[in-house]
Interface confidence: low
Amino acid sequence: LRLLDFPAPVCAQEGLSCRVKNSTCLDDSWIHPRNLTPSSPKDLQIQLHFAHTQQGDLFPVAHIEWTLQTDASILYLEGAELSVLQLNTNERLCVRFEFLSKLRHHHRRWRFTFSHFVVDPDQEYEVTVHHLPKPIPDGDPNHQSKNFLVPDCEHARMKVTTPCMSSGSLWDPNITVETLEAHQLRVSFTLWNESTPYQVLLESFSDSENHSCFDVVKQIFAPRQEEFHQRANVTFTLSKFHWCCHHHVQVQPFFSSCLNDCLRHAVTVPCPVISNTTVPKPVADYIPLWEPRSGSSDYKDDDDKGSSHHHHHH
């Protein structure tokens, strides 16, 4: 979690002098309670927006918007504390709107916005707006909270953000899997326009339980420029056990921008439905998955480099 450093955030508006300050997330009114406190925010809305940094990078940001209730408590409203909590890490970041003038009722409802919290792909946040001063102990709460889920890098707008592009979001490998004779599986995918090595990881499971019964890793060496966007093929020899038939295939790139932390693409191949005539055929009903960057199969030095097939169809 961080704040955009450009442009400087603004909370002043017509009829209100205001400044945005960094906050420790512990407003003074928690420690020194006041007798008269304002009511809670109304209609808190969180939306995904996108912002450019001075360096030209594009980042997802949380756009926070809320309005004030039309009651007399606005006379005691001294500001607001905005808090964003990243749920998987418990990391919290806060800013404070400090009102430098008294609010007065006017012909339209007071509305506030803030769009400077930079968020990460595929993360969930709890956004809280606390009106200040905070209430006395056992007083009515004067905050409103909402959860906000940031889409992953498969989302069209997210795909072109700096954190997603850095992890390889623009590459679509279009993985296909084909079962062959003699316990073999052929994996094909489209190479990206970078001379980078790839790994193809196969893990097989039994149909009846989630029991891993076979795994192998194969290396594809960095393609030459003329091979960019071509199809690469890797053929795996599968376990001889017929019950070891549920296959999970991952393609892991090593792009220079993310090295070992690139987004992986995966497909699963279910066990075949047993029928009278079982003819090997392309698997059409695999389930495409978008794997997170971290995973249990990070780069191993003992991958099976010797038996990798690297064919290109021109």
Epitope: L1, R2, D5, T53, D57, F59, V118, D120, T162, P163, M165, S166, S167, S195, T196, P197, A222, F254, S256, S257, C258, L259, N260, D261, R293, S294, G295, D298, Y299
Partner: antibody, heavy 118, light 107 residues
Framework: EVQLVESGGGLVQPGGSLRLSCAAS????????MNWVRQAPGKGLEWVSF????????YYADSVKGRFTISRDNAKNSLYLQMNSLRDEDTAVYYC???????????WGQGTTVTVSS | DIQMTQSPSSLSASVGDRVTITCRAS??????LAWYQQKPGKFPELLIY???TLQSGVPSRFSGSGSGTDFTLTISSLQPEDVATYYC?????????FGPGTKVDIK
Amino acid sequence: EVQLVESGGGLVQPGGSLRLSCAASGFTFSSYSMNWVRQAPGKGLEWVSFISARSSTIYYADSVKGRFTISRDNAKNSLYLQMNSLRDEDTAVYYCARPKVGGGMDVWGQGTTVTVSS
Amino acid sequence: DIQMTQSPSSLSASVGDRVTITCRASQGISNYLAWYQQKPGKFPELLIYAASTLQSGVPSRFSGSGSGTDFTLTISSLQPEDVATYYCQKYNRAPFTFGPGTKVDIK
């Protein structure tokens, strides 16, 4: 402004320990892998360690493997290098460095000096 | 592990001269190579990445070429401010080894 600031260097006896820190600002630290690189007095650059954005992948140079531990706290925008069983040859300026999208390391700290001597 | 070597280890040239530094990898590394400039008492600065791409803000007199095992850094017209040590570095796979450096000064 994109910035890396190292701290924690100092004088330590052989066999001792130090913990280096690198404070990052001006960019989304949690989106970037990070590296430690060192430079012994009058010598060239030596890559020391790498940690991926979410700590899922970690690498060390053979010369420090088993003695140094790289870690990060994305909540605090900080990178760390725990150095144990220090030797004379670990005396160097230690830099933290951010990989560039596309390759190389485009953001470096000013460095912190570690002196191992009895 | 892949070893990186640089030649020459040092050179002296006149202002305006064309200067060439070579870097060799013991195995192919495609174009996963960066060049850095380090002035005395300063931290290194990225000049070239992906073997031939000029880093933003770096003067155009610097250029890089090569792929696989042999790489070259060229300064087309040496300037007094180019006095420094130049390092190559591979980054295709760990360890992300640096070359031993080439010290450049003015005659």
